[in-house]
């Protein structure tokens, strides 16, 4: 069976302040079962941006229907971007466990924020 891959097709995305940013991510398989999470940064201090199974993330919406049983598109849209949102975002697949176990990370997408046009 082919090993699961997490694909973030864009290395970088540039968005004007106040607009929405779309960060793309797809997985090549739903197996092993487990959630997808988005983080900004790496290592123990990374910031959780979106969790597929729990939490309240008012500025983040999934691009595709997350309740589809065969959904493998885990792209997200972040609204009302500010300069504080700049950074590299990683889409990370976990497999189920207690706690869930990190399995595979995408290569990351760097978000840069342009000044709002005057």
């Amino acid at each position: 069976e082919e090993e699961l891959q997490v694909i973030q097709p864009e290395k970088s995305v540039s968005v004007a302040a106040g607009e929405s940013a779309t960060l793309n991510c797809t997985a090549t398989s739903l197996i092993p079962v487990g959630p997808i999470q988005w983080f900004r940064g790496v290592g123990p201090g990374r910031e959780l941006i979106y969790h597929q199974k729990e939490g309240h993330f008012p500025r983040v919406t999934p691009v595709s229907d997350p309740t589809k049983r065969n959904n493998m598109d885990f792209s997200i849209r972040i609204s009302n971007i500010t300069p504080a949102d700049a950074g590299t975002y990683y889409c990370v697949k976990f497999r189920k466990g207690s706690p869930d176990v990190e399995l595979k990370s995408g290569a990351g997408t760097e978000l840069s924020v342009r000044a709002k046009p005057s």
């Epitope: 739903l30 197996i31 092993p32 079962v33 959630p35 597929q52 199974k53 729990e54 229907d65 997350p66 309740t67 589809k68 049983r69 065969n70 497999r95 189920k96 207690s98």
Partner: antibody
């Protein structure tokens, strides 16, 4: 509080049709996948069908082609259209809210469908 | 698809620990849940996602998994726990939900 209230059950003859409804309240219905699960008298639970928030549908092997799940997100109602009913469809039909990973966290009280000549 | 196998019945004295097992499915492609059903009532979810307990379910209910077997453990069983317990699974390969045949828990 999450509430799921089924209706539309009753006694029908073999070959006839019936439409079940499940009215949902206490949560954002349009954001949740939903399912129908049935239980024949004295038997165990059987998953019938599921539907995503965007209305992608999934069916158990025993009902494909005869039963159709649908939803109206503007009215917070889940439906099950049942055609060409047979005695084997006699059961209590429950609607259930799905968790993020397609298990069930809340159940309705059920509605009884009896198919008898 | 796959089958989930449970013992038809389990008996336990009040205050003792009851364990109900469920085997079948593939650990890596399946999430499991446990549903309690008392006579004439709708099912109630006592465990989902293998080991997650809803907030309104007593702490004496717990779930665990080992290989292809999942277990519902009820510690300090009470008379009110007498019910049928169904193991349920969702298979990420087939997109299908499956239930075990149910286990009747009798509190002696």
């Amino acid at each position: 509080d999450v509430q799921l209230v089924e209706s539309g059950g009753g006694v029908v003859r073999p070959g006839e049709s019936l439409r079940l409804s499940c009215e949902a309240s206490g949560f954002t219905f349009s954001s949740n996948a939903m399912s129908w699960v049935r239980q024949a008298p004295g038997k165990g639970l059987e998953w019938v069908a599921g539907i995503s928030s965007g209305s992608d549908t999934y069916y158990g092997d025993s009902v494909k082609g005869r039963l159709t799940i649908s939803r109206d997100n503007s009215k917070n109602i889940l439906y099950l259209q049942m055609n060409s009913l047979t005695a084997e469809d006699t059961a209590v039909y429950y609607c259930a809210r799905e968790t993020w990973n397609h298990l069930f966290d809340y159940w309705g009280l059920g509605t009884l469908v009896t198919v008898s000549s | 698809s796959y089958e989930l196998t449970q013992p038809p019945s389990v008996s336990v004295s009040p205050g003792q620990t009851a364990r109900i097992t469920c085997s079948g499915g593939d650990y890596y492609s399946t999430y499991y849940a446990w549903y309690q059903q008392k006579p004439g009532q709708a099912p109630v979810t006592v465990i989902h996602s293998d080991d997650k307990r809803p907030s309104d379910i007593p702490e004496r209910f717990s779930g665990s998994s080992s290989g292809t077997t999942v277990t519902l453990t009820i510690s300090g069983v009470q008379a009110e726990d007498e019910a049928d317990y169904y193991c349920g699974g969702y298979d990420g390969r087939t997109y299908i939900n499956t239930f075990g045949g149910g286990t009747k828990l009798t509190v002696l």
